[in-house]
Amino acid sequence: VPPGEDSKDVAAPHRQPLTSSERIDKQIRYILDGISALRKETCNKSNMCESSKEALAENNLNLPKMAEKDGCFQSGFNEETCLVKIITGLLEFEVYLEYLQNRFESSEEQARAVQMSTKVLIQFLQKKAKNLDAITTPDPTTNASLLTKLQAQNQWLQDMTTHLILRSFKEFLQSSLRALRQM
């Protein structure tokens, strides 16, 4: 069964297909489930989840974050601005999701599923935003050098980076989910 679909839906072809909003909502919740599984392995493997040194490592990462100006919060919400921010943010997260590949032992398939499902989610959202201004895509060269830099870190920093990516991606998706429900 593909991510974002119920086996019941697949088995019942007479039922209407999911609307765009339903697909997006379901896809985000599927990815969030995957993140939870990855976080579980990360937290079991190291003490990063309780570490107080997060801020130290976070300074070296430029993870996408929702800010007031992005129009995704309850105060100052703006449907168009927010949709652009969600898509841009997900595109920026892609390099970090690539970094997560090979960072897991027992959850290797789950890490791949999160990455692939995010690509599908981006496609869903781009269809929804087809009338909006062009969305800027991250520069592939910049992404390649960032990936090399992250992979060259020592073990402790790599563990911390993994933890921070998962935590930030979870927060970003939760904010996106809340915002998309007003769209």
Epitope: K8, S21, E22, Q74, G76, E79, E80, R181, Q182, M183
Partner: antibody, heavy 120, light 111 residues
């Protein structure tokens, strides 16, 4: 204090038109998806239509599709329902409702309603 | 479009517990956790009690609780009080981008 005040209801003949308005205050109107819900005399509630916070997406109940149009003016903090080709079965109290923030399909504030009567 | 089914009426004595059911299909009540419950007093607009199946709305007493099993959602009111006498309506998201309401249940508090 959140307030939703409906207006524009009244008596109209079958086939006629009406435009309902809902003036919102006490909250950032442009941040919320909004809906119209109606209640026929002595009957249950019926969901009519929904509009997204920025007005990009709209949804309608099958019973009103093609006849009713939901719209909003965020600069005026106002929600509208244009009702054309009205039928006697459209007779009801029409409520303007706000969707709870970040929640899928729950209505946290309701106006007091405006009565629409379709009769010859 | 079929209405989600609720019993027309239920009753209970003060201090007791009552449960109101809301039976739908896999396309509405059974689809996701998108059930909400409302209290409606005569001549008044409905008031949100429960959303997302089991989350209490702001300011709602913990005597009110919600749950769901399969295609049926339930609202439970414990420690019944005379002021609980009202109509209770469930609502659910329905696949395809619409919503559906139950027919409503009138709660009578005896005595």
């Amino acid at each position: 204090e959140v307030q939703l005040v409906e207006s524009g209801g009244g008596l109209v003949q079958p086939g006629g038109s009406l435009r309902l308005s809902c003036a919102a205050s006490g909250f950032t109107f442009s941040s919320y998806a909004m809906s119209w819900v109606r209640q026929a005399p002595g009957k249950g509630l019926e969901w009519v239509s929904r509009i997204s916070s920025g007005g990009i997406s709209t949804y309608y109940a099958d019973s009103v599709k093609g006849r009713f149009t939901i719209s909003r003016d965020n600069a005026k903090n106002t929600l509208y329902l244009q009702m054309n080709s009205l039928k006697p079965e459209d007779t009801a109290v029409y409520y303007c409702v706000r969707y709870a923030w970040g929640v899928q399909w729950a209505f946290d504030f309701w106006g007091q309603g405006t009565q629409v009567t379709v009769s010859s | 479009q079929s209405v989600v089914t609720q019993p027309p009426s239920v009753s209970g004595s003060p201090g007791k517990t009552v449960t109101i059911s809301c039976a739908g299909t896999s396309s509405d009540v059974g689809y996701g956790n998108y059930v909400s419950w409302y209290q409606q007093l005569p001549g008044m607009a409905p008031k949100l009690l429960i959303y997302d199946v089991s989350k209490r709305a702001s300011g709602i007493a913990d005597r009110f609780s919600g749950s769901k099993s399969g295609n049926t959602a339930s609202l439970t009111i414990s420690g019944l009080q005379s002021e609980d006498e009202a109509d209770y309506v469930c609502a659910s998201y329905r696949r395809g981008g619409t919503a559906v309401f139950g027919g409503g249940t009138h709660l009578t508090v005896l005595g």
